[in-house]
Amino acid sequence: QVQVVTQDEREQLYTPASLKCSLQNAQEALIVTWQKKKAVSPENMVTFSENHGVVIQPAYKDKINITQLGLQNSTITFWNITLEDEGCYMCLFNTFGFGKISGTACLTVYVQPIVSLHYKFSEDHLNITCSATARPAPMVFWKVPRSGIENSTVTLSHPNGTTSVTSILHIKDPKNQVGKEVICQVLHLGTVTDFKQTVNKG
């Protein structure tokens, strides 16, 4: 049967993003419509046809355009994605003979981790804090020269859609740690990044 091929995309916040649909059919469509999937009913964003060209709905005027003007292959581009743009989008190819044939492409917005790593001595112990803020939520691990060191982790969700994960390493005999390297590992979207800290006696 006739189908539409799409690909989901993951793009960084405040960068451009494109979604593409391809009608796997010998014939072009008469009109292509892009809609954003919403809880109640989909919202029309933009249409393209030979008769009327590109028609962008007012709510999307400065946000998107059709950057591949095809009736078989259609691409929409968001100029500067925000968290509100995350979601799934439907492309509808209205074809002669077979009606509306649709595909769905989903856009995920990510924010690269911002990491801070610092330590603090008190009289009998040392706290090393590693905090990572990202979208989706990052994971924080420790690489320390010896085992048996306790840590505690706190997760905080922010209104802007990012999540902070703060892990505190509790070292009971700080003298043994002086001059040694501690590594905080941040895992985000399948990539692990090492952040190194050498403890110096203040």
Epitope: Q1, N25, F96, G97
Partner: antibody
Framework: QLVQSGAEVKKPGASVKVSCKAS????????ILWVRQAPGQRLEWMGH????????NYNLKFKGRVTITRDTSASTAYMELSSLRSEDTAVYYC??????????WGQGTLVTVSS | DIQMTQSPSSLSASVGDRVTITCKAS??????LSWFQQKPGKAPKSLIY???RLVDGVPSRFSGSGSGTDFTLTISSLQPEDMATYYC?????????FGQGTKLEIK
Amino acid sequence: QLVQSGAEVKKPGASVKVSCKASGYSFTDYIILWVRQAPGQRLEWMGHIDPYYGSSNYNLKFKGRVTITRDTSASTAYMELSSLRSEDTAVYYCGRSKRDYFDYWGQGTLVTVSS
Amino acid sequence: DIQMTQSPSSLSASVGDRVTITCKASQDINSYLSWFQQKPGKAPKSLIYRANRLVDGVPSRFSGSGSGTDFTLTISSLQPEDMATYYCLQYDEFPYTFGQGTKLEIK
């Protein structure tokens, strides 16, 4: 461009299969459609097929009596109408379209249903 | 199904006349309408598609207009060879449906 099979006389309850042979173009690039015209009546859309995929769409008025198929190796489309009745007596035409642009038609096939 | 109603059912006009045939859809069909010419014993011939686009090779005296529910086929200067029956076809919604036809005769 589109050549249809010859006239047929059928008895009520029988089936008829009309062929439409395409030449001079890439068969899978155009939809093949079937319309019919009973004596003194308007044209009636029966259905169509996209030879590229073999996807077809039928007018539900025919209640499953019509089947449109294609043989890409022979560049031929077929329209079969079953459970024939006298009111199916008509000229059956195949045509081709690129989207909604209809350009070539077969010469028509007269199907007479009579006991 | 969408009903297509043509008017008039038949008309007689003289060579050189401007002739207008109308087609009314029972619901909005956008611009998804074609016009066909059919001569006795012959297959239909496409004249206009998408309401106002002329098919290649069709004389420029034929033109189409309209959108939504009301459509018009105009022959600007009638010629003897235009004697035929004219049909409109909607293809906005399946099943696609034809008008009942307008028989055009030359006076």
